[in-house]
Interface confidence: medium
């Protein structure tokens, strides 16, 4: 029988007439174009919906917008429209929405051809109100609001400037000119890349790396020969041009580009990218392509300094020019990632880690689940992931895999059970031990949403024709009910719930289609007298994390340390609320050689956890550069793995001499580096 | 020889704070894990915490997160343990001891203990008002 | 945290015959454990690591042994200097916990 149909389901009972009374119908009358919903806060209950119907002319766009306001997660809208003085708005923009709980949005609207600059609208109320204001540019992108201060705004302009402003969009003060990429970094720091001659096109590696502090007072060139760079964690990242020929390298600062290092990886040339695939605090994930158009490459993950990198994975599918790649982190379950790999017959698979990238494998085959056609044998096989890469190819797959950190150890993912994955229709899978062990959860392609925490998922099939059944489980996708939300079907467009997974409300988007018109209509459902009571401690039992042999006594021991969760049992029908905080207990492991990287100038054999050196290195000494200066380094081989937390046991030692002498790489030597003020 | 050398005893008052050292002679200082244990007036013995002299990386027993603070000097191969927020029950022998930990001699993937070979002689704390 | 029971608290034992001292521990330690001598007014002094490997210099009378939660320290003619207060303690997981003590006195 199908996933959850059989008779150990228990049901939730009346749970037709709660949810009845819980399902709010918002038809919009205006007409079918494109539409974009944006949540305004955290627990504010604030949606945006813009809907935009354009009509092409020869000469120019003509278009209309309206723009609607809930403040109940969707149940109710308003049309607000006149707020913003009834203007078209620019959907390339979308709605900029603000940091944190900051109520800030920022719409950017269409203006006729012969205006000096752009317009925008305004709001600091949770879209309360607006506030027209005038640009004295056409921006190129959207507002970028500074993480730290919401009040500072930067955007491009159509001409490549760099245009600033530090009262929300009130007044702007253009900083630079000849600006092809600029970023916040931290303490409301800006960097950005700008060329001397030509173009951002025409100057490509030969760009220069500029930082302002205080909002363009004053400016530091921090790098040269730049062809671009990337922010990630505590990392900047340029790639440089090589000094003799086309190919360039990565450098890396952990000080906002005031001293760079050499990053350890491979050059590229000019029809390979590097691609930051992951990055926090501790380490970074990088993507090196290979040479050619081979549509793969090697992802490497770096120590603490983001300078030595170790090879983690080979033949890592990445389309060429950086377009689709299906590394997706496992956000439920620390250390876990999912990829694909391109196998020598072309073949896609799929990959996990549960270690930051230190062993990669293939995910377990479903235990209710037959070997498709691709397996050569029947009984032995994966369970490989559709992601990005089948979405771009338009197979079947409605959706990315899912994973909330909430949520803790649930991974939703479509999939196919073999060699490889298939072109075929596939089947929703669910992990709940973040990706250990799998189920089929669903026969076909479905939507699908986390609520409160885990407490419920909701799916909707992938249809081509009109849908009124949605479908919810209350036991992490073993059982299903479903629920007829309205009598006349619609066509569905798109799942809608608050970001963050702790809502009980989701908004089910479409449109109706009769003869003369068609109209945009959502259903919002709001679960919560389905989970009638709160969880109480009984609700939840002990789960250790990333426990596969419980005789094992390294057992869960990753990183260097266990963790124990609290989770909700699967029987329990509870709300663990929008307060829920997930309850772990972290406990420390002895170290071993699981637990250290292997240093500058030595390598792991296959199969070995051992590092031994490098062949070509064996002898000499160990020198290398490190923020400018030469150094020295007696190590045996080790370094502690980036967020690795075991104590006591093995510690390989390693020191590192400053030999007090200069070097650099063709990069940027501090005589290069200079400081200008406006 | 390997020698462990604590500072002389302290007495404090409630709510103070006490800081004691632990100097390391006789091998590579940043080699070996030191571990903190300390023992009240008639009763065992209580792990307080460790750290590593590499990177200066600790662990504390939950008991004692928060009030508890160890930190190394690699220069002088010393380890410090500070205690805050003193209290009569903190009145102990806390004792230094290093984890005599190396490249693992029971197969390179096992996580081996090679338990506290070496003590320093302790450090008596009265916390007394 | 992982709890250490020893038992028995107190062993009277006279001096040339055996003594059995054991340690259990609340869940596997696999053989992340090590048994210490303390004396009055001295620092505990390492005997066994690795549930039963002996530690530098330490006569060949103990002995270390079990795996998983039960842990004997086993010493097989008590000389006089033998009489002190006995613990276990487990590394397999922080924080690293003692028994309560095993004291054997001179019968």
């Known amino acids: 029988s199908a996933p959850g149909e059989d008779e150990e389901c228990g049901r939730v009972r009346d749970f037709v007439a709660k949810l009845a009374n819980n399902t709010h119908q918002h038809v919009f009358d205006d007409l079918r174009g494109s539409v974009s919903l944006s949540w305004v806060g955290d627990s504010t209950g604030v949606i945006l919906v813009l809907t935009t119907f354009h009509v092409p002319l020869v000469i120019m766009t003509f278009g209309q917008s309206k723009l609607y306001r809930s403040e109940d997660y969707g149940k109710n809208f308003k049309d607000i429209t006149d707020l913003i003085n009834n203007t078209f708005i620019r959907t390339e923009f979308g709605m900029a929405i603000g940091p944190e709980n900051s109520g800030k949005v920022v719409l950017t609207a269409e203006v006729s051809g012969g205006s000096r600059g752009g317009r925008i609208f305004r709001s600091s109320d949770f879209a309360k109100n607006f506030v027209q204001t005038d640009l004295p540019f056409h921006p190129l992108t959207q507002m970028m609001y500074s993480p730290q201060n919401s009040d500072y705004l930067l955007a491009l302009s159509t001409e490549n400037g760099l245009w600033v402003s530090k009262n929300f969009g009130g007044k702007w003060e253009e900083i630079h000119k000849a600006v092809c990429l600029a970023k916040w970094g931290s303490d409301n720091t800006i960097f950005f890349t700008t060329y001397a001659n030509g173009s951002c096109k025409a100057d490509l590696g030969a760009l220069e790396l500029w930082r302002t502090s205080d909002l363009g007072k004053s400016f530091k060139t921090i790098g040269v020969k730049i062809y671009s760079f990337g922010l990630g964690g505590r990392f900047l990242f340029a790639s440089v041009m090589a000094d003799k020929d086309t190919t360039r390298r990565i450098h890396v600062s952990t000080d906002q580009g005031d001293t760079w290092s050499m990053a350890q990886l491979p050059s590229v040339g000019q029809e390979q990218f590097y691609s930051i695939l992951a990055a926090n605090d501790d380490m970074v994930f990088m993507h090196v392509d290979e040479p050619g158009d081979t549509g793969f490459g090697t992802i490497f993950t770096s120590d603490d300094r983001g300078i030595v990198y170790s090879k983690s994975l080979d033949r890592h599918l990445y389309t060429t020019t950086g377009g689709e790649t299906d590394f997706t982190n496992v956000t439920s379950l620390r250390g876990v990632y999912i990829t694909s790999v391109l196998s020598e017959d072309n073949s896609i698979q799929t990959m996990i880690t549960f270690d930051q990238g230190g062993r990669w494998t293939h995910l377990r085959k479903p235990e209710n689940s037959e070997c498709d056609a691709t397996a050569k044998n029947k009984n032995e096989c994966s369970l490989h992931i559709h992601a990005s890469y089948s979405i771009s190819q338009k197979l079947n797959v409605p959706m990315a895999p899912l994973s909330e950190p909430n949520a803790v150890g649930i991974v939703i993912a479509h999939g196919s059970v073999g060699d490889a994955i298939s072109v075929m229709v596939p089947d929703v899978y669910i992990s709940d031990d973040g990706g250990y062990s799998w189920t089929k959860m669903l026969e076909g392609p479905h939507y699908y949403t986390i609520l409160d925490s885990g407490g419920i998922i909701v799916a909707i099939e992938h249809s081509s024709r009109p849908i009124n059944v949605i479908k919810f489980s209350t036991d992490e996708g073993q059982c299903w009910q479903t629920y007829t939300f309205t009598r006349d079907p619609i066509y569905f467009t798109g799942l809608a719930s608050e970001p963050g997974a702790r809502s009980m409300n989701i908004s089910i988007w479409g449109f109706t289609e009769s003869f003369a018109t068609s109209q945009w209509v959502s259903y919002t459902i709001d679960f919560k007298d389905i989970l009638e009571r709160n969880c109480e401690e009984k609700d939840y039992t002990i789960w250790l994390a990333h426990s596969t042999d419980p005789e094992d006594y390294e057992d869960g021991c990753i990183l260097g340390y266990k963790e124990q969760f609290l989770r909700l049992r699967k029987s329990s029908v509870c709300q663990n609320g929008r307060d829920y905080v997930v309850t772990k207990q972290p406990s420390i492991c002895l170290c071993s050689l699981e637990d250290f990287l292997c240093d500058f100038g030595y390598y792991r054999p296959e199969n070995d956890s051992k590092c031994v050196e490098q062949p070509e290195l064996k002898g000499h000494d160990l020198e290398f550069c490190l923020y400018g200066r030469e150094e020295h380094l007696t190590t045996n081989g080790y370094r502690k793995i980036p967020g690795d937390k075991c104590q006591g046991g093995v510690n390989p030692v390693r020191e590192v001499k400053d030999l007090k002498k200069k070097c650099t790489s063709n990069f940027l030597s501090p005589e290069k580096q200079n400081s200008k003020s406006n | 020889q390997v020698q462990l050398v604590q500072s002389g005893a302290e007495v404090k008052k409630p709510g103070a704070s006490v800081k004691v050292s632990c100097k390391a002679s006789g091998y590579t200082f940043t080699s070996r894990y030191m571990s903190w244990v300390r023992q009240a007036p008639g009763q065992g013995l209580e792990w307080m915490g460790i750290?590593?002299?590499?990177?200066?990386?600790?662990s504390y027993a939950q008991k004692f997160q928060g009030r508890v603070t160890m930190t190394r000097d690699t220069s002088t191969s010393t380890v410090y343990m500070e205690l805050s927020s003193l209290r009569s029950e903190d009145t102990a022998v806390y004792y230094c001891?290093?984890?005599?930990?190396?490249?693992?001699?029971?197969?390179?993937?096992?996580?081996?203990?090679?338990?506290?070979?070496?003590w320093g002689q302790g450090t008596t704390v009265t916390v007394s008002s | 945290e992982i709890v250490m029971t020893q038992s028995p608290a107190t062993l009277s034992v006279s001096p040339g015959e055996r003594a059995t001292l054991s340690c259990r521990a609340s869940?596997?330690?696999?053989?992340?454990l090590a048994w210490y001598q303390q004396k009055p007014g001295q620092a505990p002094r390492l005997l066994i690591y690795?549930?039963?490997t002996r530690a530098t210099g330490i006569p060949a009378r103990f002995s270390g042994s079990g795996s998983g939660t039960e842990f004997t320290l086993t010493i097989s003619s008590l000389q006089s200097e033998d009489f002190a207060v006995y613990y276990c303690q487990q590394a397999r997981l922080g924080p690293w916990t003692f028994g309560g003590g095993t004291k054997v006195e001179i019968k």
């Open positions: 001891a290093r984890d005599p930990s190396g490249i693992a001699a029971a197969g390179p993937a096992s996580r081996y203990y090679y338990g506290m070979d070496v």
């Open positions: 690795g549930a039963s």
């Open positions: 750290i590593n002299p590499v990177g200066g990386s600790t």
């Open positions: 869940q596997s330690v696999s053989s992340n």
